[in-house]
Each structure stands twice: as C-alpha cells, then as structure tokens.
C-alpha cells in the first residue's frame, strides 16, 4: 500500500514540475525591468527566451520574437537546450511512469519489470528536474552578471545634461516557476526511485533448508529474520529488498554526467 | 463617436475642494487608460494624473501628490479628479484625455477641458 | 523628470513654406526593449483641445495630412511641416510617453507672415 502511495505521489509531484517546466519554457517573463531607478515607467520590458515583450500604460502589449538562432547569446540557446531536454525527459519519463504504476493492470506484466520502469522513469524525472533547475540557474547567473554589468554603468553621459538610462533587468516569474517546479520533478522522481525499491520481488538463489529439531521442525527461510521484526507478518507476500547494489549503481554512476550542475 | 465631456469645474477658495467628472462614450471605456491634463493660464501644458487599465494603477504629478485622487466608475462610464486642498497654481483648464492604446502611449482623444479657479 | 526643451518658441512663416521646429529631451525617450521613441507631437489651435499628430517619434496618426512629419531619435526630435497652410496656424506641443510624469515641452507657436 505504502509503496503503490509512494509511487502515485511521485508520478503526480512530477506531473506538476513537469507542467511547471514547460510552462516556465513558455513564459515570457524570465526577466523583467528593473524598476528600482524607474518605479514610474510608462513603458515596462520583460523577456523571455523565445521572445520579448514591451507592456505600456495604455495596456498595450507588443511581443517580437527572436528570429533568428546565429544571432542569439550562447548562453540563451544552451538554457533553451536545458528546458527542452528537461521537457523531454520529463514527458518520457511520464508516459513510461504511467505504464509503471502499480494500480495499473497492463495485460500479465511483471512485478519486475513494472519495477524497472518505475526506477526507469524515476530516474527520467532526477535529470528533467536537474536540467531546469540548472537551466534556469545559467540564466539567473546570466541575469545577475549583466545587472551588475549595467549598475556599472548605469549612465552613460551623451554630452551636457543629457542622459540615456540603461535598461537593467532582474528576475522574472518564470525563474521561480522553473526552480520549483525543477524541484518538484526531482522530489517526484526520488519518490519514484524509492517505490521501485518496495517494487523490486524478492530474488534469491537459495533454497529453504530445514533443520529438524527434536518433536518438530522450524524452516529457516533466508528472510524470514527480517519479516519476524517488524517488517510484515505475511513473508508469503512481503518482497523484502536486499539492498539494492543494482539501484545504487545506477546512482552512483549518474552524476558524473552532470558535472557541470 | 469617440467622446470626453469634462465638468464639475469653478470657482473655488484656496484651501477648497472640486471634483472633476468626464463622460466618456464612443468607446470600450474600461479598455482605455485615462489621464487629466490641465492647461495654465500662461498655455503651458501639464499632465496630472493618469490610472491604467492593467491593474488600475494610478501616477501623480508630484504638486498634486496627496491632495487629487484619480479614479474611475466603469458602470457610469466616467472619470473623476478628486481636488483638495487647492492652491492658486492650480487655476487652469482641466483636459480629460484617454491614451491609445497602439498610440505608444499618446493621447489620442481630449475633451474640450472645464476650467477651475483658484482664488480668494 | 524628463525635461523637455522646445525649439524656437514662435515661427513666423508664409502659406506653402517648409517648417521645422525642434525638440530636445533631458533623457533618451528610446525605449530599448522595442527600439522605439516615445514622444508624442500635438497641435492646438486656440480655443480648442490638443489634437494628436504624431506618435512615437514620426508616426502620423490616422487623418493627419502627410505633409506632418516626425523624424529624431533619443533625445533630438523634429517636427517637419513641408508646405505649411492657413489652418496649420498653431500652437505645437511635445511630450514625453516614455516616463512618469508625463511632461511636455513648452510649445511652439506657429504664425502666419
């Protein structure tokens, strides 16, 4: 029961970061004016990464979108990469999830190989969370470097009494949605991963052995110490975990793809 | 027919109160940001107050900061200045104008204006 | 505030002259976002309300004759009326759309010979 809750849990946590994330992609508000020298603008800018967007008082919005790709800052195009293998991890990983999940009959199949998909997916979820988080921390990085870039110069004199302001920008809504919703995926696919491990059947090459005492027999089942301490009464049904080497393999070899996080 | 029709204007003592209503009609009034503009006796052009349609924020010109209050009644159609306080370099020719809203935040319609007096 | 500065305060012309009158901003009115100006050119004759001209630095607004024409960019604007009649005979404002408060320039009054 605990593991089918734990397993539901991470598929809707992670169906939430997973819709966060394409809709922090979506936004248009990744970064907006700085209204610290201005909080009287009749004219407010706000960007996104596919297009950016001027709001004036009149209520008029005008958004252009960045027609071209040679053009555009490397950083940019790298934090759109993020999100967008983000997206897709994360949408494979759903799709696979819903296969996984165990209150879901599919035909015959395997307790097994439902574990798998659900590690599988869990996994999906880990690195869509890590992609937008970092995607959205390049960008934030990016942000904090040009405002203080722009703070540098703030004014730049044109001659006489004249003076030209420099737009300076700050964080947007869509920075936040994306860190939580990175977070979410991650907390989703971390739930994913532990429900595998309640998941996984019992798998032993050893066979019961019985000892005969004196007046009557005691089978010693390889086990059967675990669900005799508080881990289940019923050791007919309990699929008792033992340890996991395989899963902790799989952990331990994942981050050295994503050193640079 | 676009239409702005100020009124409420007068003579008023220093220290007094007026309010300004204007009358839209010819258009979506609660699409449109409103301001007032008043015109001195010496034809100089000054912007008072204006509130948006995004979020109904409201700006002052900083003389007028604390004593005139923009507001607006969407079910009536109509805009108000709520004047307090009032100074003699207050007297002038009092605009309602809507800003366009393609018009790069330009007025792009003006009543004819209700003239306010300040004097003792 | 944005300090607007109109250029020359009076113009006396003849019907069917070419008239250039100024406008200088104490900061840019380009908003960098959109690359565009946000200034504004209005016309009043006496008597009467302000009526829009030109919006965004030099764009006619709609059924205003083309002979009204607005160029400039930052802080130097200019507004051009390339054969001036009888009925141009006013008094010409700029403003500034760009930042609260909205300021206008003290005018430019346009006379016949």
């Known amino acids: 029961m605990a593991v089918t809750a734990c397993q539901g849990l991470g598929f809707v946590v992670s169906l939430i970061g997973i819709a966060g994330i394409i809709a922090a992609t979506c936004m248009d508000q990744w970064s907006t004016q700085d209204l610290y020298n201005n909080p009287v603008t009749a004219v407010f800018n706000y960007q996104g990464l596919w297009r950016s967007c001027v709001r004036e008082s009149s209520g008029f919005t005008e958004c252009r979108g960045y027609f071209t790709l040679l053009g555009l800052p490397a950083m940019l195009q790298a934090v759109r990469a993020l999100m967008i293998v983000g997206i897709v991890l994360g949408a494979i990983g759903l799709l696979v999830s819903i296969f996984a999940l165990k209150c879901i009959r599919i035909g015959s199949m395997e307790d097994s190989a439902k574990a798998n998909m659900t590690l599988t997916s869990g996994i999906m979820f880990i690195v869509s969370g890590l992609c937008a988080i970092a995607g959205v921390s390049v960008f934030a990085n990016m942000l904090v470097t040009n405002f203080w870039m722009s703070t540098a110069n703030m004014y730049t004199g044109m001659g006489g009494m004249v003076q030209t302001v420099q737009t300076r920008y700050t964080f947007g809504a869509a920075l936040f949605v994306g860190w939580v919703a990175g977070g979410l995926t991650l907390i989703g696919g971390v739930m994913m991963c532990i429900a595998c491990r309640g998941l996984a059947p019992e798998e032993t090459n050893y066979k019961a052995v019985s000892y005969h005492a004196s007046g009557h027999s005691v089978a010693y089942k390889p086990g059967g110490f675990k669900a005799s301490t508080g881990f289940g009464s019923n050791t007919k049904n309990k699929k008792i975990y033992d340890g996991g080497a395989r899963t902790e393999d799989e952990v331990q070899s994942y981050p050295s793809k994503h050193d640079y996080v | 027919e676009v239409m702005l029709v100020e009124s409420g204007g007068g003579l008023v003592k220093p220290g007094g109160s007026l309010k300004l209503s204007c009358a839209a009609s010819?258009?979506?009034?609660?699409?449109?940001?409103m301001s007032w503009v008043r015109q001195t006796p010496e034809k100089r052009l000054e912007w008072v107050a204006t509130i948006t349609v995004i979020g109904g924020n409201t700006y002052y010109l900083d003389s007028v900061k604390g004593r005139f209050t923009i507001s607006i009644d969407n079910g009536k159609n109509t805009l108000y200045l709520q004047m307090s306080s009032l100074r003699s370099e207050d007297t002038a020719l009092y605009y309602c104008?809507?800003?366009?809203?393609?018009?790069?935040?330009?007025?792009?319609?003006w009543g004819q204006g209700t003239s306010v007096t300040v004097s003792s | 505030d944005i300090v607007m500065t109109q250029s020359p305060s009076s113009l006396s012309v003849s019907a069917g002259q070419k008239v250039t009158m100024r406008c200088k901003s104490s900061?840019?009115?380009?908003?960098?976002?959109?690359?565009?100006?946000?200034l504004a050119w209005y016309q009043q004759k006496l008597g009467q309300p302000p009526k829009l001209l030109i919006y965004g630095a030099s764009t006619r607004e709609s059924g205003v004759p083309d002979r009204f024409s607005g160029s400039g960019s930052g802080t130097d604007f200019t507004l051009t009326i390339t054969s001036v009649q009888a009925e141009d005979l006013a008094v010409y404002y700029c403003?500034?759309?760009?930042?609260?408060?909205?300021?206008f320039g003290a005018g430019t009054k346009l006379e016949l010979k």
């Open positions: 900061q840019s009115l380009l908003n960098s976002g959109n690359q565009k100006n946000y």
């Open positions: 010819g258009f979506t009034f609660n699409s449109y940001t």
């Open positions: 403003q500034n759309d760009y930042s609260f408060p909205l300021t």
């Open positions: 104008a809507r800003m366009g809203q393609t018009q790069r935040n330009a007025m792009d319609y």
